[in-house]
Structures are given as structure tokens and as C-alpha cells.
Interface confidence: low
């Protein structure tokens, strides 16, 4: 049985193979119970966490994880050497930088050691699962009386990232947002000095080096301008 | 013979138009001249008739195809020649090896419209016209607002370093007539220049509410 899994990370081509054993007609064998789906994310191409929902097992089970890279020099099956635990039960595996090959097809296999035929395999494109660290060192430059320029840094190859800038004033109900290419700078050409502005940025590994759907965390916010809480009702919604 | 200094400048609009200006001190006004375009790796060539735009300069547009067709890329080189008729023969007056993506000037932005206007602020949007998909998001914009009693030249330039086809103008005066213009430039190209300014968009801010201190 070959099932396509639509994962929320855009890996529509990931496939999972469920290996079924023969079973008596009156009851399902343990080996037919589906294994939880493995979700992997590569954090800033520094390490990767592959996790699963251990609580979905009918009884606490230390599932094991193996991985390899399809059709490559790294196609030797590897055992997980660094498990992650949830309430003393395995719930994930952490791979270090030297074990990550972004542009080779990553194959991950979850197995029930007590029922070895109960296993599930998924194929993942790691370049679509990269999550960069949040942008850092946000700085604002005043270009003129009414113009601001926001700059930031990323701890990664800048050319691989796109960015989303959000800003709002203490008068606004909601954020205004604007996408920005690899240049990691944003111009706000018309500002009101009577308002207090808040800016924040997040980044994504897209579109040149991968097609990741997931954004980084938001940066720490940066503020500019004077407080004008006297006149407006929205100031405190900002920090909510 | 035609003497004097000659200047031959062309820009590619990134899709299907190369616009050229040729100026020559002491050139004969009634001479018939053309620009010939010969790409190094395309099967087509193109010609346009130079028409006078001032005492000593002529201009023409090489139309390479339908407005949104992508006729050239960053590795094309187009040999551009100014040819003028002398009796029954043609004489070459100027020549350049033209790299289209090093000499870009996009069309002026179009479809300017007021999205929302208040007493002190106005949100305006626009669209870019005939811009190559090769640029992806690698464009920037400049804008300016004409206030009452000022000229366009006095209007401070507002910079948008990102591809953003809208702007929210702040700190405007209530119940006042303004005009707004925007222009666009790709990041690519050593000799790339700003597009012409868009047609001005006229708008009026809302009057302040009666009895309110604004």
C-alpha cells in the first residue's frame, strides 16, 4: 500500500510505504497499526529534528528511526544516534550538520522494534524543510525627515532567503506587511513623527536555494518615534 | 560630410522595445536617418526611422515584437547602427554593441489609483508595465508628491528599496489638492536608469471634521 502524504510543509511528493503483514480475519495484527508520521525540519542548516507523535501509540513504545539518502554516496542506512524523548519515550531524532545533505533525497524510516515488520518509510526533500533563525540586529536609519530604512542580518547565506517585514503604528488595528527579496532592507518612505512605529521581520528559505513553506520566528521588534498614547486607543494592543 | 561630436544612446524596456536618441552637432536637418538593430543570436533584425526631437537630436523606437513578448535576454548583444542616406548610398554615422540588460529603462508605472484617503494620509497603488519576468522582485521605486505652491523639482524624493506597488503618504494637510508620481528601476545593469515618471495622479485629502482640533 503506497500512500501519498500531504504534509503541511509543502512536501507533496513525500510518500510513505506501510508494510502490512498477513492477518487473521477476526482481528487486526499489531503490525497493521499505522505508525505516526515523521516531521523533519532543518534549522538554519545547523541541525535537523525529525519528530513524531509518540502519544499516538496505543501503548508507550520506543520507536526507532533509521535514515539514508536515496541514490547517492550517502545511501548507507544510518541509525539515529541522538534520540529526543517525550516522557521517557522516543519522540524524535536529531541529526547534526555533517549528516545533513540538503539536495539529496532523504529517506526516513520509523520502526517498532517489538514488531519489526511494522515500519513506515518517508522520502523528504530537505531543501524544502529549512527554517532559518530569526533575523537579528534590526536597525533603523533616518534617510530624511519623513523616510526610514530598516536593515537586518541573518545567520545564513543571504541569497537563499526572502523576508517578510511587518510594521504598525500605535494608531493601527493591524500590521502592514511587505515581502522583500534577498537584499534584507526595507524602505518606509513616508512616516509620521507623531506616531510610534514597531517593525519586525521573519525570513524563509525560498525561492532560490529551496522552496520552504515555513517562516522563521519573528525577530525581536524594533521601535521608532514618539509615544502618542494620549490620543489613541490602540497603543496597548501592540504588546498583546 | 557631417562633422561635429556625435552621441548615440539607447535603452531597452526589458521586453520588446529599444528606444534610441542620436545627437550630432552640425548635422543636416533634412537628412534621412535610421537605426538598424542586428542581434548576435537571433534570426530577426529591426529598423526604425529617426525623427527630429530638437535642433540637433533625433529619436526612434525599435519595436521588436508585441509589447509583452520577451525578445532579448541578459546574454544577447545587439549591434546598433545609425545609418544616414547620402544621395543613393547609406553612410554609417554611429555604432554600438548594445547589451540590453546593462542598459535598461522601464516604461513608466501605470494604473495609479487612490486606494484610501483620509484627512492626513492617502494610500496609493500602481502597476508596472511591460517589465520582464526575469527581474522577479529585483526592482526599486521612487515617488514624489506635489504640494500646493511647489514645483515637481522641489518635491522631495521618496525611496522604496523593495518591489512595492503601493505607498501610504502620511502627514498630509486636510482638504488639500495634491499630485503624485512614481518611477521604477531594475537593480540590474551598469547603465540602467530610472523610468520616466508616471502620469500624475491628482487627489484631495478629506476635510477635517468640524470642531475638532487637527
Amino acid at each position: 500500500l503506497n500512500t501519498t502524504i500531504l504534509t503541511p510543509n509543502g512536501n507533496e511528493d513525500a510518500t510513505t510505504d506501510f508494510f502490512l503483514t498477513s492477518m487473521p480475519t477476526d482481528s487486526l495484527s499489531v503490525s497493521t497499526l499505522p505508525l505516526p508520521e515523521v516531521q523533519c525540519f532543518v534549522f538554519n542548516v545547523e541541525y535537523m529534528n525529525c519528530t513524531w507523535n509518540s502519544s499516538s501509540e496505543p501503548q508507550p513504545t520506543n520507536l526507532t528511526l533509521h535514515y539514508w539518502y536515496k541514490n547517492s554516496d550517502n545511501d548507507k542506512v544510518q541509525k539515529c544516534s541522538h534520540y529526543l524523548f517525550s516522557e521517557e519515550i522516543t519522540s524524535g531524532c536529531q541529526l547534526q550538520k555533517k549528516e545533513i545533505h540538503l539536495y539529496q533525497t532523504f529517506v526516513v524510516q520509523l520502526q517498532d522494534p517489538r514488531e519489526p515488520r511494522r515500519q513506515a518509510t518517508q522520502m523528504l526533500k530537505l531543501q524544502n524543510l529549512v527554517i532559518p533563525w530569526a533575523p537579528e540586529n534590526l536597525t533603523l536609519r533616518k534617510l530624511s525627515e519623513s523616510q526610514l530604512e530598516l536593515n537586518w542580518n541573518n545567520r545564513f547565506l543571504n541569497h537563499c532567503l526572502e523576508h517578510l517585514v511587518q510594521y504598525r503604528t500605535d494608531w493601527d488595528h493591524s500590521w502592514t506587511e511587505q515581502s522583500v527579496d534577498y537584499r534584507h532592507k526595507f524602505s518606509l518612505p513616508s512616516v509620521d513623527g507623531q506616531k510610534r512605529y514597531t517593525f519586525r521581520v521573519r525570513s524563509r528559505f525560498n525561492p532560490l536555494c529551496g522552496s520552504a513553506q515555513h517562516w522563521s520566528e519573528w525577530s525581536h521588534p524594533i521601535h521608532w518615534g514618539s509615544n502618542s498614547s494620549k490620543e489613541n486607543p490602540f497603543l496597548f494592543a501592540l504588546e498583546a | 560630410a557631417v562633422n561635429g561630436t556625435s552621441r548615440f544612446t539607447c535603452f531597452y524596456n526589458s521586453r520588446a522595445n529599444i528606444s534610441c536618441v542620436w545627437s550630432q552637432d552640425g548635422a543636416l536637418q533634412d537628412t534621412s536617418c535610421q537605426v538598424h538593430a542586428w542581434p548576435d543570436r537571433r534570426r530577426w533584425n529591426q529598423t526604425c526611422e529617426l525623427l527630429p526631437v530638437s535642433q540637433a537630436s533625433w529619436a526612434c523606437n525599435l519595436i521588436l515584437g508585441t509589447p509583452d513578448s520577451q525578445k532579448l535576454t541578459a546574454v544577447d548583444i545587439v549591434t546598433l547602427r545609425v545609418m544616414c542616406r547620402e544621395g543613393v548610398r547609406w553612410r554609417m554615422m554611429a555604432i554600438q554593441d548594445f547589451k540590453p540588460f546593462e542598459n535598461l529603462r522601464l516604461m513608466a508605472p501605470i494604473s495609479l489609483q487612490v486606494v484610501h484617503v483620509e484627512t492626513h494620509r492617502c494610500n496609493i497603488s500602481w502597476k508596472i508595465s511591460q517589465a520582464s519576468h526575469y527581474f522577479e522582485r529585483h526592482l526599486e521605486f521612487e515617488a514624489r508628491t506635489l504640494s500646493p505652491g511647489h514645483t515637481w523639482e522641489e518635491a522631495p524624493l521618496m525611496t522604496l528599496k523593495q518591489k512595492q506597488e503601493w505607498i501610504c503618504l502620511e502627514t498630509l494637510t486636510p482638504d488639500t489638492q495634491y499630485e503624485f508620481q512614481v518611477r521604477v528601476k531594475p537593480l540590474q545593469g551598469e547603465f540602467t536608469t530610472w523610468s520616466p515618471w508616471s502620469q500624475p495622479l491628482a487627489f484631495r485629502t478629506k476635510p477635517a471634521a468640524l470642531g475638532k482640533d487637527t
Epitope: 541569497h159 534577498y182 | 546593462e102 527581474f135 540590474q188 545593469g189
Partner: nanobody
Framework: QVQLVESGGGLVKPGGSLRLSCAAS????????MSWIRQAPGKGLEWVSS????????YYADSVQGRFTLSRDNAENSLFLQMNSLRAEDTAVYYC????????????RGQGTLVTVSS
Amino acid sequence: QVQLVESGGGLVKPGGSLRLSCAASGFTFSDYYMSWIRQAPGKGLEWVSSISSSGDTIYYADSVQGRFTLSRDNAENSLFLQMNSLRAEDTAVYYCARGDAVSITGDYRGQGTLVTVSS
């Protein structure tokens, strides 16, 4: 100023090989990731491969994995792309790019070299 000059492109039959070179100048070559990107006729840019400043980490796009090999010579300020088992879909202009600004901006990218794979 930063200069990147590609060479080695040309016409080759499917299954054939080419070696592209990129000569870099105007910056400290050994400080930068370097990349190759390509643009097929009428298509957008496609990233091909990147190599770390020391050359110990190399990334390839799925479409070229196992066929292309990227290397660099920091002493000679040179970047190389060995392309084997070429296919018609590899036909493109190949650009050498300084790794911190891979884009079509031209700021840190060469003029390109044309690779045509055709029988």
C-alpha cells in the same frame, strides 16, 4: 570592482561533457561562498550549485545531482563546474555568482556562458 568572468560554454551532444570556469577578481575570493545559477531560454533563474569558502561543503540542485561536480581553487581565484551526462534540459546560460548575492541583479554575477545541449 567585483568581476566574474565565465568561460567553457558551447554546443555539446546529449550525454556529453563540458567544464565551465569562472575567473574572479576585485574581492577576497576565499572569503565567499560561490555559486552557479542558470537561465534556460524563456525561463526564470534556476540555482545549480554552491560551494563554501573553503570548498568543504558543496550543495547541488536535485536536477544536476550526480552529474555535475563543483570545485574551486582559492589560490587561483577560480571556480569550476564539471558537467557530465548532459541533457537537452541543461541548455541555458550559466552564470557564476558570488555567494552572498545570488540574483539577477548583476552586482555580483558574471555575464554568463551559453551551454547548448542538442543532437
